[in-house]
């Protein structure tokens, strides 16, 4: 129950989080337009990762793609990979973890094939989830360093006779919800990853043998508890008959209300 | 065709208050920022408030700020101005105006004239 | 606070001539974010409220005739009346539209000769 409940926690986790690194990536917000020394401008600029937009006090938002992939910055190129790449990594990895959530049964699949899949979307979580606090990371470094030098320099014209006012950019909404949603899907990543050990069968286990024995139906299974927890798993355990106990695998096969979460 | 009306100018006393209206039809008022503009005779134009489409901001030059207050009632379609503390100063032609694409005050009302005398 | 510097205070022209008006701002109108320059250009006639002309400097209005043109950027601007028509007699007024408080030039009061 314990493994379920953090696999599935861990699925949850990271959906929002993949969905969070989505928007984040989509987001016009990665970097706006520092108001600390005029507060009341009229006009507001505000960055992206594919556009560029300007907010009029009238109400009118005007908004310009970067229609060169040349002419951007390197900087700007590696960050987009990088949300990407973490966006790719966390549509497969939900894909493979949705195949091997322990509530969904497809066919015969072995609880082996269960626990590898789910370290699998684990892997891929943990990376996505890097992928996007880095993504974000390397574009707020980005953005440090041409806070300071434009403050260095706030005051560019020729020959300082012409007051020209350089725009400075700060940290946007964008980078907030990257932070937050990378943190999520490697958090979700980790508690799948943890959740596969639970899944995984024991290297030492040993063949269940059913015994009759007399005036009873009693089904004995050697390994003690672990056949009731679900740290061990034993699916070639046949059933005596339906008045007797069942094996762990014969109570999943036919599931009640309370395994569906 | 965009129409702004503007009303509630007359004569007013030094230190009197007064309420200015602009009621506006043929455009989705809700949407566009609006604006104040005051023309004292004879002279030039002054900006006097602008107020944002969701009413979240409102903004005034220093020789207004802290008497005058420009509020809006979407449902109603109309932009005011409520003006407190009036000086002789303040005498003019106030309009109010609509604005549109690059912060410009594309329509404009016919205005209303205020006089503050004693 | 953004001082707009309009020149001259007035001008008399010759119908069909052209006309020139200037406009100096103390700080740049250029935006960086989208290279626009917001400086606002409007029209007075005797006994009538102002009309717009020009916005983000050189985007004319639906609506005004071709004959007005608007140049300039950064603080230096300049509205052109091609061939001076007697219905342009008017004050012409240039107007920061790029930050709070929002400033309007002297006015330039254009008549014919």
């Known amino acids: 129950m314990a493994v379920t409940a953090c696999q599935g926690l861990g699925f949850v986790v990271s959906l929002i989080g993949i969905a969070g690194i989505i928007a984040a990536t989509c987001m016009d917000q990665w970097s706006t337009q520092d108001l600390y020394n005029n507060p009341v401008t009229a006009v507001f600029n505000y960055q992206g990762l594919w556009r560029s937009c300007v907010r009029e006090s009238s109400g009118f938002t005007e908004c310009r793609g970067y229609f060169t992939l040349l002419g951007l910055p390197a900087m700007l190129q590696a960050v987009r990979a990088l949300m990407i790449v973490g966006i790719v990594l966390g549509a497969i990895g939900l894909l493979v973890s949705i195949f091997a959530l322990k509530c969904i049964r497809i066919g015969s699949m072995e609880d082996s094939a269960k626990a590898n899949m789910t370290l699998t979307s684990g892997i891929m979580f943990i990376v996505s989830g890097l992928c996007a606090i880095a993504g974000v990371s390397v574009f707020a470094n980005m953005l440090v360093t041409n806070f300071w030098m434009s403050t260095a320099n706030m005051y560019t014209g020729m020959g300082g006779m012409v007051q020209t006012v350089q725009t400075r950019y700060t940290f946007g909404a964008a980078l907030f919800v990257g932070w937050v949603a990378g943190g999520l899907t490697l958090i979700g990543g980790v508690m799948m990853c943890i959740a596969c050990r639970g899944l995984a069968p024991e290297e030492t286990n040993y063949k269940a043998v059913s015994y009759h024995a007399s005036g009873h139906s009693v089904a004995y299974k050697p390994g003690g508890f672990k056949a009731s927890t679900g740290f061990g798993s034993n699916t070639k355990n046949k059933k005596i008959y339906d008045g007797g106990a069942r094996t762990e695998d014969e109570v999943q096969s036919y599931p009640s209300k309370h395994d569906y979460v | 065709e965009v129409q702004l009306l503007e009303s509630g100018g007359g004569l007013v006393q030094p230190g009197g208050s007064l309420r200015l209206s602009c009621a506006a039809s043929e455009f989705t008022f809700s949407n566009y920022a609006m604006s104040w503009v005051r023309q004292a005779p004879g002279k030039g134009l002054e900006w006097v408030s602008t107020?944002?489409?969701?009413?979240?901001?409102?903004y005034y030059p220093d020789s207004v700020k802290g008497r005058f207050t420009i509020s809006r009632d979407n449902s109603k379609n109309t932009l005011y101005l409520q003006m407190n503390s009036l000086r002789a100063e303040d005498t003019a032609v106030y309009y109010c105006?609509?604005?549109?694409?690059?912060?410009?005050?594309?329509?404009w009302g016919q205005g209303t004239l205020v006089t503050v005398s004693s | 606070d953004i001082v707009m510097t309009q020149s001259p205070d007035s001008l008399a022209v010759s119908l069909g001539e052209r006309a020139t008006i200037n406009c100096k701002s103390s700080?740049?109108?250029?935006?960086?974010?989208?290279?626009?320059?917001?400086l606002t250009w409007y029209q007075q006639k005797p006994g009538q409220p102002p009309k717009l002309l020009i916005y983000?400097?050189?985007t004319r209005e639906s609506g005004v005739p071709d004959r007005f043109s608007g140049s300039g950027s950064g603080t230096d601007f300049t509205l052109t009346i091609s061939s001076l028509q007697a219905e342009d007699v008017a004050v012409y007024y240039c107007q920061n539209a790029y930050s709070y408080p929002f400033t309007f030039g002297g006015g330039t009061k254009l008549e014919i000769k």
């Open positions: 107020i944002s489409s969701g009413r979240s901001s409102t």
């Open positions: 105006a609509k604005l549109g694409r690059g912060n410009a005050m594309e329509y």
């Open positions: 983000w400097a050189s």
């Open positions: 700080q740049s109108l250029l935006n960086s974010g989208n290279q626009k320059n917001y």
